[in-house]
């Protein structure tokens, strides 16, 4: 028998979609061989309709696709806009159509149930509102209006104009009779339940002259939208539940094996700790719609997600919901990189941020994830140069190394910098990534003076000490501005006594400003790099003052007083309350997104980088 397995029978109705999953043994040959969906003809031949090699027949154009999940040994055929012509016998298989590695699937597309003549069909999702329209003749205007539900051969009264309300519909149904001249009454049912599904009868008057109208109410469980995202990627769930619940608390939950739905995040401030640092619920629009972004997708994030509205911020029957089935593909296009970057107080980190290499011109951003309320991510820096004020002199976004990666450098680290940061662009949102910065015990490897005052017109020499392990690295000095860090000429000055254990291998690289001008005031960085990969940096602020004493000024190694916890807030660099509001670009209309969950380390150039999951920003 064939090792391929799938549904033997699939039945649906016109206009619907089906998603047919076929299973195969995930051997390496099977994983990479062609997958197909074909229709069996009268001659016995099986005509390919869609394949994993990109072929789609004209009959399926724009309404079908085939997605392979090699790590699971499955592939999925999605077919939309079904018509009765799609009914027939099919095969899903591997290799070539005529070989035995296939499974027979019967697809039956029907028209839907037969209804009494003149029946009005109302198709509404569970939790939503329906308005049933009931016409009547003038002579029945003063008479009793009623709505019945047909159950088998009997009719059960649901509501009437004499103020009767069936207990099953209490607090969620109303009958409206318009003013004179309008020969129609309406019944509005809110917060529809699955049990409301069925055939209803409107009635005005009684006896042989009564007016009757049949209404077929189809209450649908929201069909889960299938979402396929890459491992380490990100996903955005767009949730539009309607104006009726615009002012009600919203939530996203994940269905668990016990049939209940665990809250992932809600607008009442609840958030599942498994999503810490990688989830945002954006503010609601006026129409009550909202979206939830999850980055750093893991295999265990797979499952069925529901968004909804309820005052408790969790799933309740009879309230509107939307559903998604999330699949996480392990054969990811998003590169593997560390999820944690470590740095020491006073030191620095260099974070590598991936982006879609096809979008080198896109704007790049870096933001700080904040968990308060629904989560937000105020931008700290962007490639056009904006840097939030309290990060002046210690944060820079560099386009290097390019070709799918940019670099963010943060120095003068304090314990306050620990947290989650997101890399993003204004392009492909699937390449959003999250990295956690951890501040660990230790000393910065690069030593620079804590505070320097230069004299106008004279010469200033700023030393930067680095340990022997950086001797093979390229050393540089650059002048920081909010558009980057402009490299300056510098020189190696041979041994220094700063690192006794390194003796003659200890190194010193100096920056000379000669003569000092007013324009020289500002932040300077000393750093190490290997090619286009940046390692550690150290920052020093240079203040410029009028000449007081003749002679040049040299900041000797002995004056390199950079205590690890010291952060000079000088010349307008002051700590201010972070007033950055959530950037709308984070939630611009977008397709389903993905981010590179594991992130590049702080000291990428460092020789003793640790595991692929964690990397130190300052090696000890």
């Amino acid at each position: 028998k064939s090792p391929v397995f799938g549904p033997q029978e699939v039945s649906s109705v016109e206009g619907n979609s089906v998603s047919i999953k076929c299973y195969y043994p995930p051997t390496s040959v099977n994983r990479h061989t062609r997958k197909y969906w074909c229709r069996k003809g009268a001659s016995g031949r099986c005509i390919t309709l869609v394949s994993s090699e990109g072929y789609v027949s004209s009959n399926y154009a724009g309404r079908a696709n085939l997605t392979n999940f090699p790590e699971n040994g499955t592939f999925v055929v999605n077919i939309a806009q079904l018509s009765r012509d799609d009914s027939g016998h099919y095969k899903c298989g591997l290799g070539i159509n005529s070989r035995g590695l296939s499974f027979d699937v019967s697809l039956e597309v029907s028209q839907g149930p037969e209804l009494p003549n003149g029946t009005e069909v109302y198709t509404v999702d569970v939790g939503r509102t329906v308005t049933i329209k009931c016409p009547f003749k003038t002579e029945n205007a003063p008479k009793t209006k009623a709505l019945y539900k047909k159950i088998g051969q009997t009719s059960v009264l649901v509501i009437d104009s004499r103020n009767y309300v069936n207990p099953n519909y209490k607090d969620r149904i109303r009958l409206r009779i318009p003013g004179t001249g309008q020969l129609i009454f309406t019944v509005v049912i809110d917060r529809l339940r699955l049990s409301d599904h069925g055939l209803y009868l409107c009635q005005a008057g009684d006896g042989s002259n009564r007016d009757e109208k049949n209404a077929d109410l189809q209450v649908l469980e929201p069909e889960p939208e299938l979402v396929y995202e890459d491992l380490r990627g990100s996903v955005t769930f767009h949730c539009a539940l309607g104006l009726e619940v615009a002012n009600v608390a919203k939530f996203l939950c994940r269905v668990n094996s016990r049939e209940t739905c665990d809250v992932v995040i809600n607008t009442l401030g609840k958030r599942d700790s498994a999503f810490e640092g990688r989830i945002l619920l954006n503010p609601q629009d006026k129409d009550g719609s909202f979206s939830v972004v999850i980055t750093g997708l893991r295999k265990e994030d797979e499952g069925r997600y529901l968004c909804g509205a309820h005052s408790d911020g969790q799933l309740q029957e009879g309230w509107p919901i939307q559903a998604w089935q999330l699949f996480v593909n392990e054969e990811s296009t998003i590169p593997r990189s560390p999820t944690v970057v470590k740095g020491v107080a006073g030191g620095s980190v260099a974070v590598l941020c991936p982006y879609n290499p096809k979008e080198s011109q896109s704007l790049k951003y870096w933001c700080l994830w904040e968990g308060a309320q629904n989560g937000r991510c105020p931008l700290l820096v962007e490639s056009q140069g904006l840097v939030q004020e309290q990060y002046e002199g210690r944060l820079s976004l560099l386009q290097e190394p390019g070709n799918g990666t940019f670099t963010v450098i943060l120095n003068q680290l304090t314990t306050q910098d620990a947290g989650f940061y997101w890399c993003l662009t204004n392009g492909d949102t699937r390449w959003r990534t999250t990295v956690e910065i951890k501040i660990i015990e230790g000393e910065p490897n690069l030593k620079v003076p804590g505070n320097v005052t230069a004299v106008l017109g004279e010469t200033l020499n700023i030393p930067c000490h680095f340990p022997c392990k950086f001797s093979s690295y390229e050393k540089y000095w650059c002048k920081w501005s909010n558009t980057g860090c402009q490299t300056l000429p510098s020189q190696d000055e041979g041994p220094s006594e700063a690192f006794v254990n390194c003796d003659e291998n200890s190194r010193l690289v100096s920056l000379t400003l000669n003569p000092v001008t007013r324009a020289d005031e500002g932040w300077y960085w000393c750093g190490v790099k290997q090619g286009h990969f940046y390692g550690e940096t150290a920052a020093v602020y240079v203040a410029v003052e009028e000449k007081k004493v003749a002679g040049s000024r040299y900041v000797s190694p002995a004056k390199a007083d950079a205590a690890p916890d010291e952060k000079v807030l000088d010349s307008g660099v002051r700590e201010i309350e972070n007033k950055a509001i959530q950037d709308p670009r984070l939630f611009a209309e977008e397709k389903v997104v993905a981010d590179t969950g594991d992130q590049a380390g702080g000291s990428r150039a460092s020789v003793d980088s640790s595991s692929s999951e964690e990397q130190g920003g300052s090696s000890k």
Partner: nanobody, 126 residues
Amino acid sequence: EVQLVESGGGLVQAGDSLRLSCAASGRTFTTYVMGWFRQAPGKEREFVATIAWSGSTNYKYYADSVKGRFTISRDNAKNTVYLRMNSLKPEDTAVYYCAASTVLTDPRRLNEYANWGQGTLVTVSS
């Protein structure tokens, strides 16, 4: 929590038919996979048939050993799933268990199903 109660088992002759029912109560509207498994004396529990649904679309899966003889169906209004068993054979003798799940990764795998009934015994004599 979902409760599943099976019924319809019994003693029949080879070649006869039986219809098993599985009624789900306490069901939230997220359940959309229900299946039948069976366990013969001294053997492991094995997959028989599963029905998965999404809106008005149904997907029916069968084990090779029952294909063409057994039919799985559901009645949404009654929250009940049925297994119609025709042309029964002595080797179909087993305790039949109903199972339910919210997510269908592979219908044949027991650990996909979080909720199980107590089982109903089907005995087919030759």
